[in-house]
């Protein structure tokens, strides 16, 4: 069987300032289990925009219904957009361990830029 | 097979405190969010509060805020509701349950419920 | 608070006959809606979750369907041991709220 990929098939996305920026992506296994999370930036300082598992994140919806368990896209929408927004965003599958989840692989990452409204 | 078994119920005067257990077996208890739901008597059904996996994100009713503390230990496979400053208004049957991942999933395993009863 | 609102409040019907129970939320729950089952004395029990996805274990007469603010429970042939008191719960965001519960009695 081959190994999951996490696929983020935009490597850029623009969004006007105030408007929703949707972020795709998709798995190719639903193996192994375990959860996504959505991070903007990479490394230890990466900032957690969603998580599947835990916690109810207001700005972020996502784009179809996580609790469908063949589900494999985990694609997300943030809502009202500012300039503090941009930066790359990265969707990354965890893999189920106790007594922590253990990272398992990430998506390229998609570049978001925010252009400023018209004045 | 799933098993959630609530504890600590009984008769109290207002204003005094409980503590309710939820004993899970028959699933890995850290891989789940918690909830307490309660039902006065003849009643619907009021979610009271909720704990996810690792307690990093934890949400009260407004009815509860200030008065009722969540809270779990993944290592004794417990999850735990303290209940202060208790009101005739929480006499209740105080059901725990669990709910797979995020904050989007159902309650797909629920206790048999232990009841509270405030009075003087 | 969304809240949620369900219809009827409670319903006489016979075995073998088709029973609809709908559910309207003050805002849109997008597919975040689940139903569950009590009996008397008894803890609720999960049926439909995320609108129209049947339980596993629950008999298949059980369907649930709806988008948005308006969603349906429906049960195409009563049989005697569903007769109970059914509610709504919707986990789009915090409160979890409840639907205020449908009885549905034998005629």
């Known amino acids: 069987e081959e190994e999951l990929q996490v696929i983020q098939p935009d490597k850029f996305v623009l969004v006007a300032a105030g408007e929703t920026a949707t972020l795709r992506c998709t798995a190719t296994s639903l193996i192994p289990v375990g959860p996504i999370q959505w991070f903007r930036g990479a490394g230890p300082g990466r900032e957690l925009i969603y998580n599947q598992k835990e916690g109810h994140f207001p700005r972020v919806t996502t784009v179809s219904d996580l609790t469908k368990r063949n589900n494999m896209d985990f694609s997300i929408r943030i809502g009202n957009i500012t300039p503090a927004d941009a930066g790359t965003y990265y969707c990354v599958k965890f893999r189920k361990g106790s007594p922590d989840d253990v990272e398992f692989k990430s998506g390229a990452g998609t570049e978001l830029s925010v252009r400023a409204k018209p004045s | 097979e799933v098993q959630l078994v609530e504890s600590g119920g009984g008769v109290v005067q207002p204003g005094r405190s409980l503590r309710l257990s939820c004993a899970a077996s028959g699933f890995t208890f850290s891989d789940y969010g918690m909830i307490w739901v309660r039902q006065a008597p003849g009643k619907g059904l009021e979610w009271v509060a909720s704990i996810s996996s690792s307690s990093s994100y934890i949400y009260y009713a407004d009815s509860v805020k200030g008065r009722f503390t969540i809270s779990r230990d993944n290592s004794k496979n417990t999850l735990y509701l303290q209940m202060n400053s208790l009101r005739a208004e929480d006499t209740a049957v105080y059901y725990c349950a669990r709910r797979y991942y995020g904050f989007n999933y159902p309650f797909d395993y629920w206790g048999q419920g232990t009841m509270v009863t405030v009075s003087s | 608070a969304i809240q949620l609102t369900q219809s009827p409040s409670s319903l006489s019907a016979s075995v073998g006959q088709r029973v609809t129970i709908t559910c309207g939320a003050s805002?849109?729950?997008?597919?975040?809606m689940h139903w569950y089952q009590q009996k008397p004395g008894k803890a609720p029990k999960l049926l439909i979750y995320?609108?129209?996805n049947l339980e596993a274990g629950v008999p298949s007469r059980f369907s649930g369907s709806g988008s948005g603010t308006d969603f349906t429970l429906t049960i195409s042939s009563l049989q005697p041991e569903d007769f109970a008191t059914y509610y709504c719960q919707q986990s789009n965001e915090p409160p979890y709220t409840f639907g205020q519960g449908t009885k549905l009695e034998i005629k």
């Open positions: 995320s609108a129209s």
């Open positions: 805002k849109s729950v997008r597919t975040y």
